[in-house]
Every structure is written in C-alpha cells, then in structure tokens.
C-alpha cells in the first residue's frame, strides 16, 4: 500500500490522543534506554510503511502484536485517513483470524514496540518539519 495520500494531520492527532498512550502502557516497566532503535524512516509515507510492517507482520519471536489495543487503533486510523487502505485489509483480516496466537509479552515484543515508538516519533518530527 502507498501511504502518500493519507491525511497525516489526522493520523498524527489520533496518535497523540490515544495510540501513543497504549504504546507507552504496553512498554510500562521498561526504560527507554533498554532497547536501541535500529529501524528508521525518512518521510511520512515511509514511516507509515514501517509502522504498518512492525505492527501487523508477525515475526518468529513476536507474533502477537496485531491483537494489542494500539494495533487495533493503528489499523482504524489508517483505514480512516488513508484512501483505499481498508480494502487492502479485507483478506488480511481473514488471515489474521486464522492464525490467532496466544498472547505473550516477550522481550522481543517489547523491543519491537520500542522500535514502533521511535518510528511514530519520527513520523511526528517529519510532520513538524513539513509545517
């Protein structure tokens, strides 16, 4: 999916109002210095591409993020403010229901969410630069 035509201001507002709080709650008990940020992004569409990938694509050591509250909210905001995004999710939703995994917060998941927080902050910064 090409995130170029999204309403970035609306996505930023949703992130600051609610998604950020859920990410921070997920990370509670860990320090910001516990993990190194290894994933970066260069512009707003690129940041959203990386955010989508880290949030919804299961990895061998962290398969459960898509069911978290911050992930559900991320999916909702992308569906709302990115033209045509929702239709790309119809088949993806069916597949996700089939591979529902037991919810376990592993260290790898915490590391992945730490990366997500960094990507979202980068997204906000690139937005501020544009303004």
């Amino acid at each position: 999916y090409d995130f170029t035509n999204c309403d970035f201001q609306k996505i930023e507002a949703d992130y600051l109002r609610t998604i950020s709080k859920d990410l921070i709650t997920y990370m509670s008990g860990t320090k910001s210095t516990d993990f190194n940020n290894t994933v970066s992004c260069s512009n707003r569409p690129h940041c959203l591409t990386e955010i989508q990938s880290l949030t919804f694509n299961p990895t061998p050591r962290c398969a459960s993020l898509a069911k978290e509250m911050f992930a559900r909210k991320t999916k909702a905001t992308l569906a709302l403010w990115c033209p045509g995004y929702s239709e790309t999710q119809i088949n993806a939703t069916q597949a996700m229901k089939k591979r529902r995994k037991r919810k376990v917060t592993t260290n790898k998941c915490l590391e992945q969410v730490s990366q997500l927080l960094g990507l979202w902050r980068r997204f906000i910064r690139t937005l501020l630069k544009k303004q």
Epitope: R17, K75, A76, A79, L80, W81
Partner: antibody, heavy 120, light 107 residues
C-alpha cells in the same frame, strides 16, 4: 442481535436546535464507527458525520461542520447528533449506521431512522 | 469529494428480467464500492460490499463487479421483492458519498 435505534426527531422551527440519539446494542461498541446518514423526502442518501469510539474522534461532511456535532455516552452505548441553526433543507430522515473500523469496513447495520421536519 | 454517478436513475422491468445498474466514480477508487437496496419507508440494506463481495443472507441473484471508476450491480432474474431503489456508495475516502439512486419499477 445487532440493534440501532434512533430517537429525538420531530417538528422544529428554523433556527432552532434538536438532538438525535442512536442507541446501539448487540455488539462491541468500540469495534465500529458510527455514522449519521440523512435522506431528504424523495431524495438520495447523504453522509453527515461519523464518530469512531475506538479512537475517540469524529469527522463531518463539510456542509454541516459547525452546525452539527457528534457526541456519545459510552456507558449507554449511545451516539448523539446535536443539530443547531436548523434550516428547512435539513428536513430529512436521519439514520445511524455502524461500520467496522478494524474489519469489514462497510455500513452493515442501520437503524430505522428518525424524521426531522424543519418548518415554521 | 468523490462523486458517484448512477445510471439509469430509474428503469422498468418484469419479473425474471436481468437488470444491470452502473455506478461511475469521479476518480479511481479501486474496489471501495458497496451496493444497498432501499424499500419505501425502510432503512437501506447492504447487498454487496467491496464491489463484488456477497453478503450472507442476500440472494445469489445479486452480484457486483468492477474496479477503478466503473462498477455494476446485476440482478440475474428479477423477483417481485426486488422492486426498490438501489444505491452505490464509496468508502475509498471521507467524505463517504452515495450515488443518486436507481429506482427499479414494475413494467
């Protein structure tokens, strides 16, 4: 089963206000956006506004922004449409409809509608 | 805003006829089109979503096709209960917009 029930319609004079309600039941409220759609007598459907409980955000048709405001009471699973400075052209049946925001993404359930008549 | 133009605005047909209604979007919207049926005094009812996806409980005589800007709703064999008004809707981007409707009447 899913139920959406609108209320609050009636006859109102131009320039006055009215508040419509949409009570939702039979599903998880936060899994769906709620939309208001209206239909003037003998006319087509017109999208008015939406509220997304999961994100606590709303969006409006520019034609109504400033005059119409959405609010909600989560404890009652109820959505409201506050309509101010009403005009004769706001006369319509007002429907609420739900739409999945993390799945389905379509208005799959509608209320029965409530008629608003703006007349002096 | 994306405009949705439906045609025809009305048509007369007989029971058993094959009926085709078209909807054209003012810009490409991939497959983000849904079709509704509305009977007098009733709320719209979802028939087809995302251009061609069928809904459980909706008779198989209703089908949809198209992508980009041109979309079609087909009723393969019109039944007495199908006389109603049909609307297309786009949810590609806000504000969501509807076609002006096609009224299917008895010939």
């Amino acid at each position: 089963q899913v139920q959406l029930v609108e209320s609050g319609g009636g006859v109102v004079q131009p320039g006055r206000s009215l508040r419509l309600s949409c009570a939702a039941s039979g599903y998880i409220f936060t899994d769906y956006a709620m939309h208001w759609v209206r239909q003037a007598p003998g006319k087509g459907l017109e999208w008015v506004a939406t509220f997304i409980p999961l994100l606590d955000t709303s969006d409006y048709n520019q034609n109504f922004k400033g005059r119409f405001t959405i609010s909600r009471d989560n404890s009652k699973n109820t959505l409201y449409l506050q309509m101010n400075s009403l005009r004769a052209e706001d006369t319509a049946v007002y429907y609420c409809a739900r739409m999945g925001v993390t799945h389905s993404y379509v208005m799959d359930a509608w209320g029965q509608g409530t008629l608003v008549t703006v007349s002096s | 805003d994306i405009q949705m133009t439906q045609s025809p605005s009305s048509l007369s047909a007989s029971v058993g006829d094959r009926v085709t209604i078209t909807c054209r979007a003012s810009q490409p919207i991939s497959i983000s089109v849904h079709w509704y049926q509305q009977k007098p005094g009733k709320a719209p009812k979802l028939l087809i979503y995302f251009a061609s996806q069928s809904i459980s409980g909706v008779p198989s005589r209703f089908s949809g096709s198209g992508s980009g800007t041109d979309f079609t709703l087909t009723i393969s064999s019109l039944q007495p209960e199908d006389f109603a008004t049909y609307y297309c809707q786009q949810t590609f981007s806000l504000p969501y917009t509807f076609g002006q409707g096609t009224k299917v009447e008895i010939k």
